[in-house]
Every structure is written in C-alpha cells, then in structure tokens.
Interface confidence: low
C-alpha cells in the first residue's frame, strides 16, 4: 500500500505571503499573477510516495510537461537545489546518472520523467515531511523546478488518493477559453498593483507551513517571471534533514561531473542542449546522446566513487514488454 501526494508545479506562493496585503486583495492578484506569468510555459510535476512495507523508503517521481529537450534533471531534498537543498541524484541524458545516499536507484522512467527510490535508516533517512524537489533544465525553456512532500497526516498504512490540486496547463487553458479571462486578469492585476504602489510597503512575513499550505510551486520559472514576481526563495521548513553534506556529496566520481552546467537556466544552449525545429536554431544544431528529451541517460562505462549503476542483465527494459507510467 502506498500513500501518495501528487504535486503539480504551478501553485500560488506560500500562505505566509498573504499577510503582506491581506486576504481579500492579495489572493486574487497572486492567482492572476501566477496565471499571467505561467501562461504558455512548461510544468514540472512531483509525486512522493512512501512504501507501506518499508516506512523509511520513498519513491519520488518527477516529470516535465514541456516541449523542450531535457538536458539535465536534478533531484534534491530539504528544499530547492541551490537554496538549501541537498542533491540526491543528477540524471544527464548523455553522461548517465549519479546519485548519493540515501538514494538507492535513480532512472529515466519515460521520455520525460524520472524516478528515484530512497531508503535509509538512521541519520540520513528521509521522513514524512521532507520536501523533495526536481529541477529540469531544458532547451529552450530554461530551468524549471517543483517541490513536493507527503502530507503531514500521511499514514503509510492507508492508501490515500493523490493530493488534489489544480494544474494550470497552458494548452488546456487555451482550449477552455481562459485566454480572455487571462487578459482581463492581467489588466486587473496591473490596476491592483498600481493601487498598492501608493500604500506603504508592507513587511513580508516569514513563510509558514500549514496543513493547507501548497506543497509545491515552480521555482524560478524563468528570468522574466522571476523579475515579475520579486519574491525570494521561500523554502518549506522541514524537521527532517540529511545528515551531513559530506555523506551526500562524496568526492571523486566520473570526470563529467565537473563539467555539468551549474545553472542551466542561464545557459540552455550549453553542451547538453538539444535544438528542436519549432524554435529557430541559433548557431549550429546541437544534440546530446539520446534525444529525449530527453528522453534518456546513458550508462557510464565504469563505476566510480559515488556513482551507482543499475544495469539490467536482460538488456533494455523496453524489450520486456509494455512500459507505461505507473
């Protein structure tokens, strides 16, 4: 039996930010701002599952709902990567997969999703309120990150349905005729922002975590939307953290590690970027091993320190039969 929390990326900011302007005037503007900023942009979804048989075992699944080519996936816990989070695994389409304890198995699951199994006992063991984040670097969209965790009340012995939360799919929004509402909302939002400009700037309260708090949002959807939001990273407080950075980041490993892009959002056309036809190519056509977007990660030839491989002795799992998103 599993307890699941399916968390879409596009969520309003933390409720703690509501204190800035008050419920009545802030909720709608934030929703509209989220709509305005994210319309036509990709999404990242995160699903966290706790195995009932092993209470310290988690399965994290992340997917990218975008049209670009995935050039790197980073899974972290304790907050977003680069904002207090600790990296658990990095999946590179060409150079393979690297993971750190307590990650047990990271793999490409489909052409645009990955999964990571965590296990642990003792200091490095994850716990129910740990926040897990997945960051997808893609071309041409840039870097997208979403975070999720199990609901605080999760009972591993119960099979709970995924946490309901609306996903703002740009394509569906268009189909449902939200474009007009969006346009109106953006205009209305500008009007509200202008009104608030003339009031004294309120003090932002620290973000609070409550049972009602959304557990995920798009971290840094783009430089443009970051500039529009002007909201600093607000990581979810967790009482459960990795033991030490030393155990999570052993030294050594394959030489490609040093050459991985540190911030793919600012360099989506790096060596790990794939050009695709709908976007006018700037310069030469660039590709990395496999194309799937993303769709994949090659196994490095040798197992080095900190690098765990999971070869399938039967060959590609694709040969075994149908593979769907479980």
């Amino acid at each position: 039996m599993r307890t699941e929390a399916q968390v879409p990326a596009l969520q309003p900011p933390e409720p703690g930010l509501e204190g800035a302007m008050g419920h009545r005037t802030l909720v709608l503007p934030w929703v509209l701002l989220t709509l305005c900023v994210t319309a036509g942009t990709p999404e990242v979804w995160v699903q966290v599952r706790m195995e009932a048989t092993e209470l310290s075992s988690f399965t994290i699944r992340c997917g990218f709902l975008g049209s670009g080519s995935i050039s790197l996936v980073t899974v972290s816990w304790g907050g977003p990567n680069g904002a207090g989070g600790t990296t658990l695994a990095v999946l590179h389409p060409e150079r393979g997969i690297r993971q750190w304890a307590p990650a047990r198995q990271a793999r490409w699951e489909t052409q645009s999703s990955i999964s990571l199994i965590l296990e642990g006992s003792g200091a490095s063991s994850p716990c129910a309120n740990t926040t897990f984040c997945c960051k997808f670097a893609s071309f041409p969209e840039g870097s997208w990150e979403a975070c999720g965790s199990l609901p605080p009340s999760s009972d591993p012995g119960l099979s709970a349905p995924p946490t309901p939360a609306p996903i703002l799919r740009a394509d569906l929004a268009g189909i449902l005729g939200v474009s007009g509402v969006l346009l109106f909302g953006c205009v209305y939002l500008l009007h509200l922002l202008r009104r608030h400009k003339h009031r004294p700037a309120p003090r932002l309260q620290p973000s609070r975590t409550s049972p009602q708090a959304p557990r995920a949002r798009a971290w840094a959807p783009s430089q443009a939307s970051q500039a529009a939001l002007h909201v600093p990273y607000a990581t979810i407080n967790t009482s459960c953290r990795p033991a030490t950075l030393d155990t999570a980041h052993p030294h050594g490993g394959p030489s490609w590690w040093a050459s991985l892009p540190t911030h793919a959002a600012h360099r989506p056309q790096g060596p790990a970027a794939w050009a695709s036809t709908p976007i006018p190519a700037r310069g030469s056509f660039v590709s990395v091993e496999n194309g799937l977007y993303a769709q994949a990660g090659e196994r490095p030839p040798h197992t080095g320190p900190g690098l765990t491989l999971f070869p399938d002795p039967r060959g590609p799992r694709a040969m075994e039969g149908p593979l769907g998103v479980r």
Partner: antibody, heavy 123, light 106 residues
Framework: QIQLVQSGPDLKKPGETVKISCKAS????????MSWVKQAPGRGLKWMGW????????TFPDDFKGRFAFSLETSASTAYLQINNLKNEDSATYFC????????????????WGTGTTVTVSS | ENVLTQSPAIMSASLGEKVTLSCRAS?????MYWYQQKSDASPKLWIY???NLAPGVPARFSGSGSGNSYSLTISSVEGEDAATYYC?????????FGGGTKLEIK
C-alpha cells in the same frame, strides 16, 4: 509483443507528397520517442530525425529540414512521416524506430524497428 | 557531423572463425551502438552502450572500444551471422551511422 507496423510500398511522381504511417503496439506509445531512418537502395542508414510522442515536438538534422514532417495520431498509437515535393533521390526504404527510453539507465538507441516502407519516386 | 567509417566494407569469413568489425569515428564518442540487418529485413539492435548485448543476441558477439575506435567481435562465426552490421553514435547531432560492414560466410 512490441511491434511497429508500417504502411505498404508507394509509387509516386516527382513533386507529389507521400505520407507513411507507423503503428505501434505492445507498449505505451507516448512513453517512447519515435525516430525515422532512411535507407536508399544498396546504401546505408541515415537518421532523419525524431518526434517526442508526448509533446509532439520534432527534431530534424539539417539534411532533412524543409520538405519533411513528422506527426502523430496518439489515440491510434501511430506516427507519420510526410515527404513533400518528392524528388527522385527520395526513393528509399523508410523505417520508423523507437527510441529506447525507460530502460534502467535510459538510452538513446533504436530498440524496436518498423517493418519498413519502400517509396519509389519515378516520372 | 561525426562521420563513422566502418572497415572492411565487405568481409568474408569461414565458419568457426573469429571476426572483428571496426568502426572509427571522426570525433570522439561516448558509446557506440551496433545494429544487424539481414537482406530485405529491418535492422535490429545488436549491441548498445558499446558492449551490452541486446536481448536474444548470442554470447559469441561482443563489443568494445572507446574514444574514436570501436569494434564488434564474433568469437566463432556461424552461418546465421551473415548480415550487414552498422555502427551508430548518439553523442553528437546529427546521429550518424557507419556505412556498414557486410559479413559473408564462406
């Protein structure tokens, strides 16, 4: 059993358009990318590009930009290759090939190949 | 583009003989993939990640190499091995195939 079954042979005149189908079965169609490979008579294999079956985004190498188009009919688990303004040099056998994602570590190889469709362009 | 050159273009071998097919890349690649194609048939994945045999491939086949030079070896050729073998790289776009080596059995 995983299969990619392609449409039958086609005879076309220069300037016409041909559309080749590739019907997938035995797996979840939108899980794996689909590539297309050209093999001219007595010649080797040439990669024509691939389409992400989830997003529908196509990627082409320079040699196949312009007259070539990939499309999907997801509900029918079918991928299509369309070649416009056919030229004599388009006479070849065209294969669809599944991009083998989803293995333990993922990969970019072509793990399942279609039956092949021979297109003959002649005036 | 990364040009893959296979040699020899045609190879004739006797049953039980050890055979090595070569594939050289104009630029270094991380892994090489091999496909087998018999006449009037579709290609089949034969070796992936340089040295891993695809399901159903006999153990007499092996793959090796790194950088610019890769090879496919058959320890003891059998009649059913008569086919054309293509190498392929995914390291850089466009993904390219070698010209193929046609293996004939005497």
């Amino acid at each position: 059993q995983i299969q990619l079954v392609q449409s039958g042979p086609d005879l076309k005149k220069p300037g016409e358009t041909v559309k080749i189908s590739c019907k997938a079965s035995g797996y979840t169609f939108t899980t794996y990318g689909m590539s297309w490979v050209k093999q001219a008579p007595g010649r080797g294999l040439k990669w024509m590009g691939w389409i992400n079956t989830y997003s529908g985004v196509s990627t082409f190498p320079d040699d196949f930009k312009g007259r070539f188009a990939f499309s999907l009919e997801t509900s029918a688990s079918t991928a299509y290759l369309q070649i416009n303004n056919l030229k004599n040099e388009d006479s070849a056998t065209y294969f669809c090939a599944r991009l083998g994602m989803g293995s333990t570590t993922g990969a970019g190889y072509f793990d399942v190949w279609g039956t092949g469709t021979t297109v003959t362009v002649s005036s | 583009e990364n040009v893959l050159t296979q040699s020899p273009a045609i190879m004739s071998a006797s049953l039980g003989e050890k055979v090595t097919l070569s594939c050289r890349a104009s630029s270094s690649v991380n892994y090489m993939y091999w496909y087998q194609q018999k006449s009037d048939a579709s290609p089949k994945l034969w070796i992936y990640y340089t040295s891993n045999l695809a399901p159903g491939v006999p153990a007499r086949f092996s793959g090796s190499g790194s950088g610019n030079s890769y090879s496919l070896t058959i320890s003891s050729v059998e009649g059913e091995d008569a086919a054309t073998y293509y190498c392929q790289q995914f390291t850089s776009s466009p993904w390219t195939f070698g010209g193929g080596t046609k293996l004939e059995i005497k």
